[in-house]
Amino acid sequence: QDPYVKEAENLKKYFNAGHSDVADNGTLFLGILKNWKEESDRKIMQSQIVSFYFKLFKNFKDDQSIQKSVETIKEDMNVKFFNSNKKKRDDFEKLTNYSVTDLNVQRKAIHELIQVMAELSPAAKTGKRKRSQMLFRG
Amino acid sequence: QDPYVKEAENLKKYFNAGHSDVADNGTLFLGILKNWKEESDRKIMQSQIVSFYFKLFKNFKDDQSIQKSVETIKEDMNVKFFNSNKKKRDDFEKLTNYSVTDLNVQRKAIHELIQVMAELSPAAKTGKRKRSQMLFRG
């Protein structure tokens, strides 16, 4: 059994999240994850889900009674979602920490917008892939 | 030329983001995107970037002077990133709108944590893939 399971059970007690009525009015994440089978679609959704948990854990970081549980779960997320890649995790954290109301951040974001947009579609990633797609179009 | 380009130039004026000094102290998004070539890694990062822009645009939604530009850019993001798939866009928006300080949301999130974690690694997605991996392990 993965180490996170026991710690997640501990968090359920802490948040009174074990009762069946918690599941009333549908799920937050599970229903959405069920909708997407394609790996890249799942990553789009999981990216938001993981950042939600990181934010949640951050809000409770000064509560010693759940620190071990939170750290264990975060470490397991690191292994599972970031494939234990520190650079990937750090880049992700950087993105989640940018303040949307900071004027310098806003300016940089708008300055970079055209290039960001150009890279959004998978086809835009490499000239190579674009060419190979053209070949299939006859 | 994609329609977003002209509108992004308009936003550059609005945010005073056209000057070269805006690029001082490195980039927000472009440097990070350069680090990741694998499609699923890129989606993890782009998911955060797109949600940043959506949040930014939301804050400025009451200013009529940039509404056309914002709508055009959002629509183009919808085409490029969500492949014009309304369901995908809606699920994404749902995830970005969950409040991390709402007690019911917190409880649901913790209630779903074990199952979310179980689905985080690509290998966990289907039993079929897990079995095929076992075969390669000799």
């Epitope: 109301t101 004027l103 | 609005y14 804050n59 400025f60 200013d63 002077s65």
Partner: nanobody, 121 residues
Framework: QVKLEESGGGLVQAGGSLRLSCAAS?????VGWFRQAPGKEREFVAA????????LYADSVKGRFTISRDNAKNTVYLQMGSLEPEDTAYYSC?????????????????WGQGTQVTVSS
């Protein structure tokens, strides 16, 4: 860099009037007034565009308050009339660092120190 300085606050009787001034240094496209009453959230009062040709008001002050600007003096004014005890608050002027014209306070990046307005019944 934008700097904002308010003046004109004070104590006034209900039904009276008061004029607040906001002196701005640096380029400002929009200037807004916000207020915060004791124990309450800060709220939008009024805003004026760079040209002075367009103004926005909170519903609670419409018809009683008038915002204006004198670009030659780099000053924005808030003329407050028919004052009520509910108008008692700390009034601050603010400016966005963008060309934003609206009432969302998160888009206002520069703030003055503020001035106290007290309306007695």
């Amino acid at each position: 860099q934008v700097k904002l300085e308010e003046s004109g606050g004070g104590l006034v009787q209900a039904g009276g009037s008061l004029r607040l001034s906001c002196a701005a240094s640096g380029l400002t496209y929009t200037v807004g007034w916000f207020r915060q009453a004791p124990g309450k959230e800060r709220e939008f009062v009024a805003a004026i565009s760079w040209s002075g040709g367009s103004a926005l008001y909170a519903d609670s002050v419409k018809g009683r308050f008038t915002i204006s600007r004198d670009n030659a003096k780099n000053t924005v004014y808030l003329q407050m009339g028919s004052l009520e005890p509910e108008d008692t608050a700390y009034y601050s002027c603010a400016a966005p660092g963008t060309r934003y014209y609206g009432s969302n306070q998160v888009n206002y990046n520069y703030w003055g120190q503020g001035t106290q307005v007290t309306v007695s019944s």
